[in-house]
């Protein structure tokens, strides 16, 4: 066969679908690799061909489009399963070609089993809701294109294993699920089951997502430096180890980049000719507020180092703050016997 532009196996789209449910999979060529769409390709005389490699096999084989009840079919650039079976798992290839042109891409399709409580190996999308923020909604995802707008499906929502009805602050509204006031107790997995008729058959679409309740932008504040502070003085003798923690609290802010850094005499620690190490740790609260701690460490501090200015800085989308650590040289205690002897005029 003549040369074909092979885009390889596209794992950026690891497609997972539930067993015994309809699945519609668009050929990724038109979405991510080619500069034209299916209609343009079709009118230019190009044909879209589908084939697959079963799981744990090397042999590419054509897809059987002559199964009973058209279980697998192709419509434009979409491959349809009505419904899927477990052994449909494999790598699928769509190839666009005519006598002079050829381009193809493969992608993995995994058919996944679920239990009666919707638990499965499916990777779940996460939807973040702001705590105590007023009415917020989640929408049943990835159901477009499965049925025409004239069909009115029935939608049932579940939290974990339990059907959502008469919940205090969670109300099903068709494809949407409304949270009147989101609380930590609303964290969990939510599933919508969409049931619709087609050609005398009934199909179910199951979609699960994880809800995570996070800090509200109403309560967000600029970074707060807990340490260093005015109450702690880092008093050291030359030769001792100097350890100064910079501990900063950051309110949760969607996608905000939180930064913590030390400057020594106004410079980046690396730019000072002393042996400084900085180690950072990060922890999160239940609402994803973040605490970052950066420990500045000088193994053997000199009297010169103890005169320097050590400033902890923090920055988030809410603002920037800085705080200097109080560092000083320990005044040596009087050496008692010598001092006393001198006091008594001993020679």
């Amino acid at each position: 066969s003549e040369r074909c532009d092979d885009w390889g196996l596209d794992t950026m789209r690891q497609i997972q679908v539930f067993e015994d449910e309809p699945a519609r999979i668009k050929c990724p060529l038109f979405e991510h690799f080619l500069k034209f769409n299916y209609s343009t390709a079709h009118s230019a005389g190009l044909t879209l061909i589908w084939y697959w490699t079963r799981q744990d096999r090397d042999l590419e084989e054509p897809i059987n489009f002559r199964l009973p009840e058209n279980r697998i079919s192709k419509e434009k650039d979409v491959l349809w399963f009505r419904p899927t079976l477990l052994n449909d798992t494999g790598n699928y290839t769509c190839m666009l070609r005519n006598t002079t042109y050829c381009s193809k891409v493969a992608f993995p399709l995994e058919v996944v089993q679920k239990d009666s409580c919707f638990n499965s190996p499916m990777k779940l999308p996460v939807h973040k809701l702001y705590i105590e923020y007023g009415i917020q909604r989640i929408t049943c995802p990835n159901v477009d294109g499965y049925f025409p707008s004239s069909v009115k499906p029935t939608i049932t929502w579940y939290m974990g294993c339990y059907k959502i009805q008469n919940f205090n602050n969670v109300i099903p509204e068709g494809m949407n699920l409304s949270f009147l006031i989101a609380l930590i107790s609303n964290n969990g997995n939510y599933t919508c089951v969409v049931t619709y008729p087609e050609n005398g058959r009934t199909f179910h679409l199951t979609r699960t997502l994880t809800v995570k309740v996070v800090g509200s932008p109403k309560n967000a504040v600029p970074p707060v430096i807990h340490s260093p502070n005015d109450h702690v003085v880092y008093e050291k003798e030359p030769g001792e180890e100097l350890l100064i923690p910079c501990t900063v609290y950051f309110s949760f802010l969607m996608d905000s980049r939180n930064e913590v850094w030390w400057t020594i005499d106004g410079k980046k620690p690396d730019d000072i000719t002393i042996d400084v190490t900085i180690n950072e740790s990060i922890s999160h609260s239940r609402t994803e507020d973040e605490t970052r701690t950066q420990i500045l460490s000088i193994k053997k501090v000199t009297s010169e180092d103890l005169k320097r200015s050590y400033v902890c800085h923090a920055r988030s989308a809410k603002g920037e703050v800085a705080k200097a650590a109080k560092v000083k040289q320990k005044v040596p205690a009087p050496r008692y016997t010598v001092e006393l002897a001198c006091g008594f005029g001993a020679t």
């Epitope: 930064e259 850094w261 740790s281 990060i282 989308a317």
Partner: antibody
Framework: QVQLQQPGAELVKPGASVTLSCEAS????????IHWVKQRPGQGLEWIGE????????TYNEKFKNKATLTVDKSSSTAYMQVSSLTSEDSAVYYC???????????WGQGTTLTVSS | QIVLTQSPAIMSAFPGEKVTMTCRAS?????MHWYRQKSGTFPKRWIY???KLASGVPARFSGSGSGTSYSLTISSMEAEDAATYYC?????????FGAGTKLELK
């Protein structure tokens, strides 16, 4: 001398995986985050993600979540990026760079040219 | 994600001429950073925190702006300034770069 060293080039077949390396020297490796940036021929810069060698915390650009995996080896002061299921779209120069606080990307590696071809 | 739009995409200037290039953000950002890249080499940090010059950057360069509109200015173009300049936002994830402004010498 403060530097980030990367191999010059890698040639890999479509569908395979490759691990790119970035060796840090001349500074305390654990004090800086290591970032990876992609640049396709004649195109702009795309941020892939970052890793903190101190605690291994990573943040990825959603676009590269299923494509790149970042790791570090503190003992050799080396950062790694594994790029999986390679396609010709992955052919690019990959740079490692570092940041500390507001000192953004103040040091870059020379870049590794990755070519995906059968 | 925040999209950064740089303009113009390509520009040219005579030696001694004043040059201004802009970077617009799709949402407000706290700071803008600029990198310079010459053909075949890695990018170099050029201006950070909107207006601070990285070490070794000539004083003829300056940066300004706030919110969604930022700019890089060269007071007097020199031959060595010919390069591609990228703006970058760091306020939110993912970190994003502009598509670059290619500055050529006339």
């Amino acid at each position: 001398q403060v530097q980030l060293q990367q191999p010059g080039a890698e040639l890999v077949k479509p569908g395979a995986s490759v691990t790119l390396s970035c060796e840090a020297s001349g500074y305390t490796f654990t004090s800086y985050w290591i970032h990876w940036v992609k640049q396709r021929p004649g195109q702009g810069l795309e941020w892939i993600g970052e890793i903190n060698p101190s605690h291994g915390h990573t943040t990825y650009n959603e676009k590269f979540k299923n494509k790149a995996t970042l790791t570090v080896d503190k003992s050799s002061s080396t950062a790694y990026m594994q790029v999986s299921s390679l396609t010709s779209e992955d052919s690019a120069v990959y740079y490692c760079t570092r940041h500390y606080g507001s000192y953004y990307f103040d040091l870059w590696g020379q870049g590794t040219t990755l070519t995906v071809s059968s | 994600q925040i999209v950064l739009t740089q303009s113009p995409a390509i520009m040219s200037a005579f030696p001694g001429e004043k040059v201004t290039m802009t970077c617009r953000a799709s949402s407000s950002v706290s700071y803008m950073h600029w990198y310079r890249q010459k053909s075949g080499t890695f990018p170099k940090r050029w201006i950070y925190d909107t207006s601070k010059l990285a070490s070794g950057v000539p004083a003829r360069f300056s940066g300004s702006g706030s919110g969604t509109s930022y700019s890089l200015t060269i007071s007097s173009m020199e031959a060595e300034d010919a390069a591609t300049y990228y703006c970058q936002q760091w306020s939110t994830n993912p970190i994003t770069f502009g598509a670059g402004t290619k500055l050529e010498l006339k």
